[in-house]
């Protein structure tokens, strides 16, 4: 029955102002942080869900959380928090996070599907790309980490966490 | 298709508090507000306030602090509201309705409301 | 509070012709070129129902006879033509500022 959500007009979404009005809009109503599939409505004066506004036209209050979520409904394919990027585990396997060891291991199991670089890797040649020198090692996490994006830049895992501000 | 289903008529005596409840289906509960509107007989609308389920979040128009509280329960997707020192200016139906959010904020599904006569 | 001033608070028409209510806010309910104004319809004995939202959205389901217009603190909401089933109460709210509030109400009535 409701249209709402479904046929939106174009413009800024609503929830974008909060980028403008940090604050809120009401007096004396301070803008909490939120959990990170939330977003502070500033009309609302709340955390709400970021899943139900991911079909805006213009929304970027949760442009990473709906980025992941559309990542998410892709076959492999995982959401690099870091990156904040969607990454093809066709373009990492060997080198793969756990969320591409379904692909990956289906993949390795069947050489004629892998693209033609892994296959090379397999059978033994050695690719000297300065491209695949920064390759992805996958998001495990444990204290200080390096930044596949900014070689020698040290994360902590704090700041690791930190993956859906706005 | 989103329901909001709410519970039956209370007849209370003045003075007395009363708990109705909304069960709500059909989406995802904690990613809506939910509001609650009062309606005297033969009157309008009148905003009550909102519940954020997900953190429990609470908002209410001046007049109905302290009367009026707001709670939910995420394991039932049920959200309820307790009126307490109930007067004959309490007697309404009482309804649930779920808040859009995001680039329009509107009520755009309803319970079936709650109807409560305070009476001696 | 934002306060909603409908009008008139009844009307008698007939079948077949065209009806606007107006709906005043005492101050202005736009944000960044959105208006924040809805209407319903409520028809006796039933829960009132989402017809139009943001101004001029007509909601999902809602007949094209249904149309809303308006910005700031003037909006309207238009029915042409005007069929029995459209007999009920319709309310104006808005949702630019907490407490959300509703206008008084308009009878609508066949003649």
């Known amino acids: 029955m409701s249209g709402l959500g479904r046929s939106r007009r174009g413009g800024r979404s609503r929830v974008d102002q909060e980028e403008r009005f940090p604050q809120g809009l009401w007096t004396g109503v301070a803008m909490r942080s939120c959990p990170e599939e939330q977003y502070w409505d500033p009309l609302l004066g709340t955390c709400m869900s970021c899943k139900t506004i991911c079909n805006h036209q213009s929304q970027r209050t949760c442009a990473a959380f709906c980025r992941s979520l559309s990542c998410r409904k892709e076959q492999g394919k995982f959401y690099d928090h870091l990156l904040r990027d969607c990454i093809s585990c066709a373009s990492i396997c060997g080198q793969h996070p756990k969320q591409c060891a379904y692909f990956c291991e289906n993949k390795l199991r069947s050489p004629v599907n892998l693209p033609p670089e892994l296959r090379r890797q397999r059978s033994g040649e050695v690719e000297n790309n300065s491209d695949n020198s920064g390759r992805y090692q996958g998001l495990e996490h444990r204290g200080s980490e390096a930044s596949p994006a900014l070689p020698g830049l040290k994360l902590s895992a704090d700041q690791v966490a930190l993956v859906y501000s706005t | 298709e989103v329901q909001l289903q709410q519970s039956g008529p209370e007849l209370v005596k003045p003075g007395a508090s009363v708990r109705m409840s909304c069960k709500a289906s059909g989406y995802t509960f904690t990613n809506y507000v939910m509001h609650w509107v009062k309606q005297k007989p033969g009157q309008g609308l009148e905003w009550i306030g909102y519940i954020n389920p997900s953190n429990d979040d609470t908002k209410y128009t001046e007049k109905f602090k302290g009367k009026a509280t707001l709670t939910s329960d995420k394991s039932s997707s049920t959200a309820y509201m307790e009126l307490s020192s109930l007067t004959s200016e309490d007697s309404a139906v009482y309804y649930c309705?779920?808040?859009?959010?995001?680039?329009?904020?509107?009520?755009?599904?309803w319970g079936q409301g709650t109807s409560v006569t305070v009476s001696s | 509070d934002i306060v909603l001033t409908q009008s008139p608070a009844s009307l008698a028409v007939s079948l077949g012709q065209s009806v606007t209510i107006s709906c005043r806010a005492s101050e202005s309910v736009e944000y960044y070129g959105t208006s924040l104004m809805q209407w319903y319809q409520q028809k006796p004995g039933q829960a009132p129902k989402l017809l139009i939202y943001?101004?001029?959205n007509v909601e999902s389901g809602v007949p094209a006879r249904f149309s809303g217009s308006g910005s700031g603190t003037d909006f309207s909401l238009n029915i042409h033509p005007v069929e029995e089933d459209d007999i009920a109460m319709y309310f104006c709210?808005?949702?630019?500022?907490?407490?959300?509030?509703f206008g008084g109400g308009t009878k609508l009535e066949i003649k």
């Open positions: 943001g101004a001029s």
């Open positions: 309705a779920r808040g859009t959010h995001g680039d329009y904020y509107a009520l755009d599904y």
């Open positions: 709210q808005q949702s630019r500022k907490v407490p959300w509030t």
